[in-house]
């Protein structure tokens, strides 16, 4: 008996062929006997089956004696024997039906987990391996299950059902909600605008949720609110926002705050946070203001950061063109009596300047 | 050119036959299918059957099973339609029609002219 | 038996007016199986499309046919005097072979 595995949905094309290369009468049954489909002349005829109006066939094979059975937008239950009766022969196809469907939404959060189903027809026996687009690899029976989702799982998997050495194909989009980064840092001079960019790691038609950006100063003994909004049709609105700093917020994706202007005290770490309706957890994204100041007070220059520096930035002052006078792996440094000229505050991470300061020291006569 | 040219009117009395002729030219006659169709006055089009004039095999609807009867005469490129125990409800235009089979599609593409049968008593 | 079933009965429009012609059929049937016809008062009907889709030998391209499943439908861009006739859909899914009940489109 020969096997055909078809996916829930789907279209099916159970072949029938006859010795004799012309239009002859033929007739398809399930294994209750009951009529599907069969010919009279040029024309379908169909029987009390359930498949009544998801039945047909291919009229323009007929006269090479080609009589198909077509199944469309498969069911499970549509699992059975099959069978072509023409030229007084039979015909026999076990036609089995998958289907494979992620048991919550396939727009998911980052870090929750992906459970895919497998609905099979009773008595079989199948196995399922499924690759992410990352080329994971998970196998499974009835269930397969992904915990802790990364946005390199989103995209395109690839599942793979084998029953009775056929196998059977499933792509199944997934989507994983996420930030495009985790983790942000913004380097700024004291008095600079500041842009953080808070963009989205996919595309959905419709995204309506609602945010907050958490603020840690360095200096402050407690994090603060510093802004809450609402996201509608991906149209952002501000609900509340703090007297200082007085963030902007732009009205279009992605998600764009403007601090007017850096300044040691907002110096510091911050958490924006977006739920999104209909979705149980949120998005995060962390982002790190690093502020520096570059000073002259009488004999004293004084260069300094505030915010979140790793141990390995070097913090330098050099007059320009010239060799640094002082470097160090701290959050200040300073030069006494310094020459006149322009003086550069530099911080760099090997080499490479992520900040710079200039300020004038002037002649002293 | 292609033409399926029908016997004249006929007037019949309820329980009388009436056979309608079909004369088709221009084509190979064993072919094509012959459909046959009727119309009452004012009414819509209702299928009766087919024939294939190659094999002679022929298929109608269960409402006319029993009183139609369609046949062919090849030599002559004739089909024939006869309907017996004639009631009033009869009374119609009588159409043949060429089915063309043409991959999956059928379609009626040549009419003849349609022959008036009037059942009265 | 697939019913078919046409709306609206009439349809009176003037020439230069889209004329839009809809066939609902009792249960799904393939775009492959429905076919349009013409009808004159005293005339044999006359095939437009076949396939749902396809327009016929010499059939003006004022007339489209669209739908798939269920509802089908027959477009007249821009009504001309000589498309003032009956309009009749056709199923040929599967035996018997019915026709909807028959669209009359008139002048207004």
């Known amino acids: 008996k020969k096997v055909v595995l078809g996916k829930k949905g789907d279209t099916v094309e159970l072949t029938c062929t006859a010795s004799q290369k012309k239009s002859i009468q033929f007739h398809w049954k399930n294994s209750n006997q009951i009529k599907i489909l069969g010919n009279q002349g040029s024309f379908l005829t169909k029987g009390p089956s359930k498949l009544n109006d998801r039945a047909d066939s291919r009229r323009s094979l007929w006269d090479q004696g080609n009589f198909p059975l077509i199944i469309k937008n498969l069911k499970i239950e549509d699992s059975d024997t099959y069978i072509c009766e023409v030229e007084d022969q039979k015909e026999e196809v076990q036609l089995l039906v998958f289907g494979l469907t992620a048991n919550s939404d396939t727009h998911l959060l980052q870090g929750q987990s992906l459970t895919l189903t497998l609905e099979s027809p009773p008595g079989s026996s199948p196995s399922v391996q499924c690759r992410s687009p990352r080329g994971k690899n998970i196998q499974g029976g009835k269930t397969l299950s992904v915990s802790q989702l990364e946005l390199q799982d989103s995209g395109t998997w690839t599942c793979t059902v084998l029953q009775n050495q056929k196998k059977v194909e499933f792509k199944i989009d997934i989507v994983v909600l996420a930030f495009q980064k985790a983790s942000s840092i913004v380097y700024k001079k004291e008095g600079e605008q500041v842009e953080f960019s808070f963009p989205l790691a996919f595309t959905v038609e419709k995204l309506t949720g609602s945010g907050e950006l958490w603020w840690q100063a360095e200096r402050a003994s407690s994090s603060k609110s510093w802004i809450t909004f609402d996201l509608k049709n991906k149209e952002v609105s501000v609900k509340r926002v703090t007297q200082d700093p007085k963030l902007q917020m732009g009205k279009k994706l992605p998600l764009h705050l403007t601090l007017p202007q850096a300044l040691p005290q907002y110096a510091g770490s911050g958490n924006l946070t977006l739920a999104l309706e209909a979705k149980t957890g949120k998005l995060h994204q962390e982002v790190n203001l690093v502020v520096m100041r570059a000073t002259q007070l009488q004999k004293n220059l004084t260069c300094e950061v505030w915010g979140p520096t790793s141990p390995k930035l070097m913090l330098s002052l050099k007059l320009e063109n010239k060799e640094a006078k002082v470097s160090k792996r701290e959050k200040a440094v300073w030069v006494l009596n310094p020459e006149a000229g322009m003086w550069q505050c530099l911080l760099s991470d090997s080499g490479q300047v992520l900040l710079e300061s200039n300020i004038k020291v002037l002649p002293t006569w | 050119q292609v033409q399926l040219v029908q016997s004249g009117a006929e007037v019949k009395k309820p329980g009388a036959s009436v056979k309608v002729s079909c004369k088709a030219s221009?084509?190979?006659?064993?072919?094509?299918?012959i459909n046959w169709v009727r119309q009452a006055t004012g009414q819509g089009l209702e299928w009766m059957g087919w024939m294939n004039p190659n094999s002679g095999n022929t298929g109608s609807t269960q409402k006319f099973q029993g009183r139609v009867t369609m046949t062919r005469n090849t030599s002559i490129t004739t089909a024939y339609m006869e309907l017996s125990s004639l009631r009033s409800e009869d009374t119609a235009v009588y159409y043949c029609?060429?089915?063309?089979?043409?991959?999956?599609?059928?379609?009626?593409?040549?009419w003849g002219k349609g022959t008036t049968v009037t059942v009265s008593s | 038996e697939i019913v078919m079933t046409q709306s609206p009965a009439t349809l009176s429009l003037s020439p230069g007016e889209r004329a839009t012609l809809s066939c609902r059929a009792s249960q799904s049937i393939s775009s492959s199986y429905l076919s349009w016809y013409q009808q004159k008062p005293g005339q044999a009907p006359r095939l437009l499309i076949y396939?749902?889709?396809t327009r016929a030998t010499g059939i003006p391209a004022r007339f489209s046919g669209s739908g798939s499943g269920t509802d089908f439908t027959l477009t007249i861009s821009s009504l001309q005097p000589e498309d003032f006739a009956v309009y009749y859909c056709?199923?040929?899914?599967?035996?018997?072979?019915?026709f909807g009940g028959g669209t009359k489109v008139e002048i207004k």
């Open positions: 056709q199923q040929d899914d599967h035996l018997p072979l019915t």
């Open positions: 029609a060429r089915g063309v089979l043409k991959g999956d599609y059928y379609y009626m593409d040549v």
């Open positions: 221009g084509y190979t006659f064993t072919s094509y299918d």
């Open positions: 396939g749902s889709s």
